[in-house]
Interface confidence: medium
């Protein structure tokens, strides 16, 4: 610059920002700093209007900072950073083009303590890493947990026990077995658990007189065939002892048999009442069993007539049908069981017939809402008690009839009862009257042929003393009702002592044991009771299936309408607690005032009128 010339570079505004000013002899020039470029493209420039603009060095080449790096442009220069998973040699960023020019190298994260969870292996990869659970562990969230191989996989062979351990497992053979590999513990299915043949391994195990028997997991010592000593399980040598000859009958034969020991053998025989399953009388086969003989099925008449046969193991028990009892005279020897009809029923015979009656005998029955029913039952039983108290003492039919009247007279109480209670009580009352009439005929007090009349029942009974010709008949009447019995009945009924018949007619009983107790298959018919309830009985064994009929003439309570058809019904105790059924009787004739019934048995009867049979309502 000439002496006295101006130094333009002293003025800081001569050159733009980011430029350096250089003074020359006669002038100056501006140069953009490194990382900047003049707006007019000249390296050296003068004058206003030219700016130094930042150069984006990051765009000057594809990878200005090198591989695995990020270039960031900053004013006048560029900053280099390594990608995640990579690092410079200093671990820091650097300025592009500076002396500290680095390369980004992969970081081995596996060198960082605790980067992977416990019981996992760390694998480094370029720019990353991965954690893998060690064998025997499984990933659960972010931790490696023990895998229970015993549960998750089939890892041990048959006859082995699996034991899970932390990170592993082991197998042990079950007691008395050993692994094919010979070790106490093993892994996997390559080895198997095999039985140790202790007998082959040690021939002296059972001593000289015993036979060694190998079993799965153990062994036992046993005597040769035909000799015995209690078999025992052994750990060492057998106890001192000798094998002695066997009595084969010791626990050899099946249940319900006896054993006969023979020289060198034996045989079994079933006990009486049992038969061998192979049909042989004497047998040895261990598979044979002695089975009970069902004597009742084998012979339906095993116990005789009117009996019940019950099979029991090895035998059978005989009992009698209802209304029958064992005949002590005819039941002396085995197979001579005999049942004879009960002459007349007592309280004990009736109690068995109904659960409701049994309730009355227990105190609680009287407190369970059966009070009215039980009062009438007990009143009826009192009559029977008087009859049965002393079976050889004379029975007063008059006093019994009076007592029955007292029960019948409690009509209001009867109507409080349920249907079942009514039919049960009706049955008891009818059977009590029959028993009392029979007792009066069998053990008469004075004249056994008598007529009793009370407000509620009339009875006529006759003892047939004089010779009664077979073609003749006996007539009995009570109120307006009659019973005609042929003399044949004397022979057929098999009476002990003088034969007798009795007939009873009940007043008002038809209103209690009414048509609702008739099981009618034709629901469209209208039914009504139209006679008193009557009953006939005869002394002796037989009460039914007579060769000739018994004729009952029953008086209608109201005249029979033309549209009505009478049904002769008898009281049947086999149906529920007692029901009217039409079986066993048929109508001989019916007038406006009477119906004549012909029946093959002694029974309690009544007439039910049915109307509207042809008209469907």
């Amino acid at each position: 610059q000439t002496l006295g010339g101006v130094n333009e570079c002293q003025d800081t505004t001569t050159c733009p920002a980011y430029a350096t000013c250089t003074d020359t002899t006669d002038s100056y020039y501006c140069t953009c700093k490194r990382g900047f470029l003049s707006s007019n493209g000249q390296t050296n420039f003068q004058g206003p209007g030219v700016e130094c603009q930042d150069v984006n060095e990051c765009l000057q080449s594809d990878s200005p900072c090198g591989p695995n790096s990020v270039c960031t442009n900053i004013l006048g220069r560029a900053k280099c950073s390594c990608l995640r998973g990579f690092s410079s040699s200093t671990g820091k960023d650097w300025i592009l083009g500076s002396l500290d020019n680095f390369l980004c190298a992969d970081v081995d994260e596996c060198l960082t303590i605790g980067i992977c969870p416990k019981y996992s292996n760390c694998s480094n990869s370029v720019g990353s890493y991965s954690c893998t659970c060690q064998p025997g562990f499984v990933l659960n969230g972010s931790i490696c947990e023990d895998e229970d191989e015993c549960v998750t996989r089939d890892v041990c062979p048959e006859h082995a026990t699996c034991h899970n351990t932390l990170g592993s497992y082991y197998c042990t053979c079950n007691s008395g077995l050993e692994s094919s590999g010979g070790g106490p513990m093993f892994q996997g299915l390559d080895e198997s658990c095999e039985d140790v043949d202790e007998c082959s391994r040690n021939s002296t195990l059972c001593g000289p007189t015993f036979i060694c028997i190998n079993t799965l997991g153990s062994y036992s010592c046993s005597c040769p065939a035909g000799f015995s000593l209690p078999t025992f399980q052994i750990l060492g040598h057998p106890a001192d002892g000798n094998c002695t000859d066997i009595d084969e009958c010791d626990d050899t034969c099946p249940l319900n048999s006896s054993c006969t020991n023979t020289i060198g053998s034996y045989f079994c025989t079933c006990h009486p009442g049992f038969a061998s399953s192979n049909g042989q009388l004497n047998f040895k086969d261990l598979e044979v069993t002695c089975e009970d003989i069902d004597e009742c099925t084998q012979d339906p008449l095993q116990c005789g007539l009117n009996s019940v046969c019950t099979n029991v193991p090895g035998s059978y028990i005989c009992g009698c049908l209802p209304d029958f009892q064992m005949d002590p005279e005819g039941s002396q020897g085995y197979g001579n069981f005999n049942c004879k009809r009960i002459l007349f029923k007592c309280k004990e015979d009736l109690i068995l017939q109904s659960e409701q009656i049994q309730q009355c005998q227990a105190v609680q029955g009287r407190d369970l809402g059966y009070a009215s029913f039980c009062t009438l039952v007990n009143a009826t039983f009192t009559i029977l008690d008087n009859t049965c108290e002393n079976k050889s003492a004379p029975v007063s039919l008059q006093s019994a009839a009076t007592s029955v009247s007292l029960v019948l007279e409690q009509a209001t109480t009867w109507f409080e009862l349920s249907k079942e209670e009514t039919s049960t009580l009706g049955t008891i009352l009818l059977e009590t009257v029959e028993s009392t009439m029979l007792a009066a005929l069998l053990i008469p007090s004075g004249n056994a042929s008598q007529m009793i009349q009370t407000e509620y029942l009339d009875i006529e009974s006759k003892v047939i003393n004089e010779e009664c010709k077979e073609n003749e008949s006996i007539n009995l009447a009570a109120r307006g009702d009659k019973m005609n019995v042929g003399c044949f009945i004397i022979k057929e009924s098999v009476s002990t002592g003088a034969p007798g018949v009795a007939f009873v007619s009940f007043a008002h009983m038809e209103s209690v044991l009414n048509e609702r107790f008739f099981e009618d298959g034709q629901s469209f018919r209208k039914l009504r009771m139209n006679s008193r309830v009557v009953g006939g009985t005869v002394t002796g064994e037989k009460k039914e299936d007579f060769s000739k009929p018994i004729i009952y003439t029953l008086q209608h309570i109201q005249p029979k309408q033309k549209s009505e058809r009478p049904i002769c019904v008898s009281w049947n105790t086999d149906v529920e607690d007692g029901r009217w059924t039409p079986s066993g009787c048929e109508i001989v004739e019916a007038s406006e005032t009477h119906t004549v019934c012909s029946c093959n048995r002694m029974a309690n009867l009544a007439i039910i009128m049915a109307s509207g049979e042809l008209t469907m309502e």
Epitope: N140, I143, C144, D146, H163, N164, T165, L166, G167
Partner: antibody, heavy 117, light 107 residues
Amino acid sequence: QVQLQQSGAELVKPGTSVKLSCKASGYTFTNHMNWVKQTTGQGLEWIGRINPGTGGTSYNVNFKGKATLTVDESSSTAFMQLSSLTPEDSAVYYCARGDSYWYFDFWGPGTMVTVSG
Amino acid sequence: DVQMTQSPYNLVASPGESVSINCKASKSISKYLAWYQQKPGKANKLLIYEGSTLQSGIPSRFSGSGSGTDFTLTIRSLEPEDFGLYYCQQHNEYPLTFGSGTKLEIK
């Protein structure tokens, strides 16, 4: 901090049952909960453990049928019911948080159970 | 089941001394053994797991060693608060089993 709070002492009659509780706090209720019996004669005996997340249980065979382990995740509480109690069941019962590697990093204070006629 | 035999049954020592407690397993349990401290009125405390790993918050004077069947708990320079009952426990397989305990008493 991790805390295990156990129910109070119990005096019960032979033949009856008792249900002990263990309330966990201070951590996420996911770790196995173990139960341990301590008697003077037998020392410490591991009864079994339950996984609160799944309800899965593992029992010591000596306590199968005697102890029943359950959890209520909503209240972070573990329960152990002991049935058909006899005087031999008289002991202190601890609940203990299980690490996934089967050791116990936190214990409850214990519940004394006395079985007496 | 793995039987754990602990010895000695009783141990008497003075503060400042070093003591060792042994635990023997009836079969190999690898490194999976834990040690616990039991003191009256306090919750049981885990000291060591996996044979030698110190539980966080436990002073470094406690150390564990051993693997397979034989293990040792060593307490260097005993402090007054170290006295109490010590139990070992195998955490290698179910059922988890404990040693019979060692009572460490102050002389």
